[in-house]
């Protein structure tokens, strides 16, 4: 038998993916484990094999269909179980009644691009990926800019409290290399969390014109 504390956390990307992480102190690395999804009002079940991500945690993605298909709604409840093989039997290691739209984590924003850049400012746009139409405009964003000589953790967070898929960065230094990231979060859901940060977008401000006051 496996003893120790267990944590089973899952998030729905709002379309067709439930990502799960299971942590178990004292679990055996060699054990084969599955996450099993049993919706209360759907005709499908889904499993994914948990793969090790560290010494005591495993992860997998329940892929429910094509990436942009709407597979669950606000009224769905999905029973999620972790089952691990013990000899010829399967033992339930963790279980939760999962409400998808209370546990949202969207995909990172994509297609970041510089729309316009000047000496002191830069206009950047992006797109959201695989986000449910149910949200309409009820999304918020956080953005951060990496300046030379600083770390991402030191970068101040810019908050956009509406569905605005662009930003105008100001008070930038001329002829300077920057990086930019953005993340998204629905307003809905008690346990909803921020998406991962987008891939960084590198850009450079224009040099100040010689002989001109900048």
């Amino acid at each position: 038998a496996v003893n120790g504390t267990s944590q089973f956390t899952c998030f729905y990307n709002s379309r067709a993916n439930i990502s799960c992480v299971w942590s178990q102190d004292g679990a055996l690395q060699d054990t084969s484990c599955q996450v099993h999804a049993w919706p209360d009002r759907r005709r499908w079940n889904q499993t994914c094999e948990l793969l090790p991500v560290s010494q005591a945690s495993w992860a997998c993605n329940l892929i429910l269909g094509a990436p942009d298909s709407q597979k669950l709604t606000t009224v769905d409840i999905v029973t999620l179980r972790v089952l691990c093989r013990e000899g010829v039997r399967w033992r339930v290691m963790a279980i939760q009644d999962f409400k998808p739209f209370e546990n949202l984590r969207l995909m990172a924003p994509i297609s970041l691009q510089v729309v316009h850049v000047e000496t002191h400012r830069c206009n950047i746009s992006w797109e959201i990926s695989q986000a449910s139409h149910y949200f309409e405009r009820h999304l918020e964003f956080e953005a951060r800019t990496l300046s030379p000589g600083h770390t991402w953790e030191e970068a101040p967070l810019l908050t956009l409290k509406q569905k605005q898929e662009w930003i105008c960065l100001e008070t930038l230094t001329p002829d300077t290399q920057y990086e930019f990231q953005v993340r998204v979060k629905p307003l809905q859901g008690e346990f909803t969390t921020w998406s991962p940060w987008s891939q960084p977008l590198a850009f450079r401000t224009k040099p100040a014109a010689l002989g001109k006051d900048t």
């Epitope: 099993h36 079940n45 889904q46 499993t47 994914c48 094999e49 892929i63 429910l64 269909g65 990436p67």
Partner: nanobody, 123 residues
Framework: QVQLVESGGRLVQAGGSLRLSCVVS????????MAWFRQAPGKEREFVAV????????EYVGSVKGRFTVSRDNAKNTVYLQMNNLKPEDTAVYYC????????????????WGQGTQVTVSS
């Protein structure tokens, strides 16, 4: 709806080898646990091997352990059955099966099926 197409079956001598392939289309391949079954003339369809969605874990019926290897290539939407040291009792139509639920795939009922490929092992 998911479609499965098997290939690679033929007449082979006892002790020989074959590799069966099954190409899956019509849905996201990595959703599916994949399995091979076989049906000999006048017998029930029987489970042969299964491979999980990630490809990390495989299981086999006792009579083929050590001789058959199931694998999958998620980039090619294909599952394989490598059959070595074939015996006359391996003669059957081999079927590829898909199910989104690992725990249901052996029960036959709710699987998606290919049309089968004939394997004949002569002594």
């Amino acid at each position: 709806q998911v479609q499965l197409v098997e290939s690679g079956g033929r007449l082979v001598q006892a002790g020989g080898s074959l590799r069966l392939s099954c190409v899956v289309s019509g849905d996201v391949f990595v959703r599916y646990t994949m399995a091979w079954f076989r049906q000999a003339p006048g017998k029930e369809r029987e489970f042969v091997a299964v491979v999980t969605d990630s490809g990390r874990t495989t299981e086999y019926v006792g009579s083929v352990k050590g001789r058959f290897t199931v694998s999958r290539d998620n980039a090619k939407n294909t599952v394989y059955l490598q059959m070595n040291n074939l015996k006359p009792e391996d003669t059957a139509v081999y079927y590829c099966a898909a199910n989104t639920d690992y725990f249901q795939i052996r029960s036959v009922d709710n699987n998606a099926w290919g049309q089968g490929t004939q394997v004949t092992v002569s002594s």
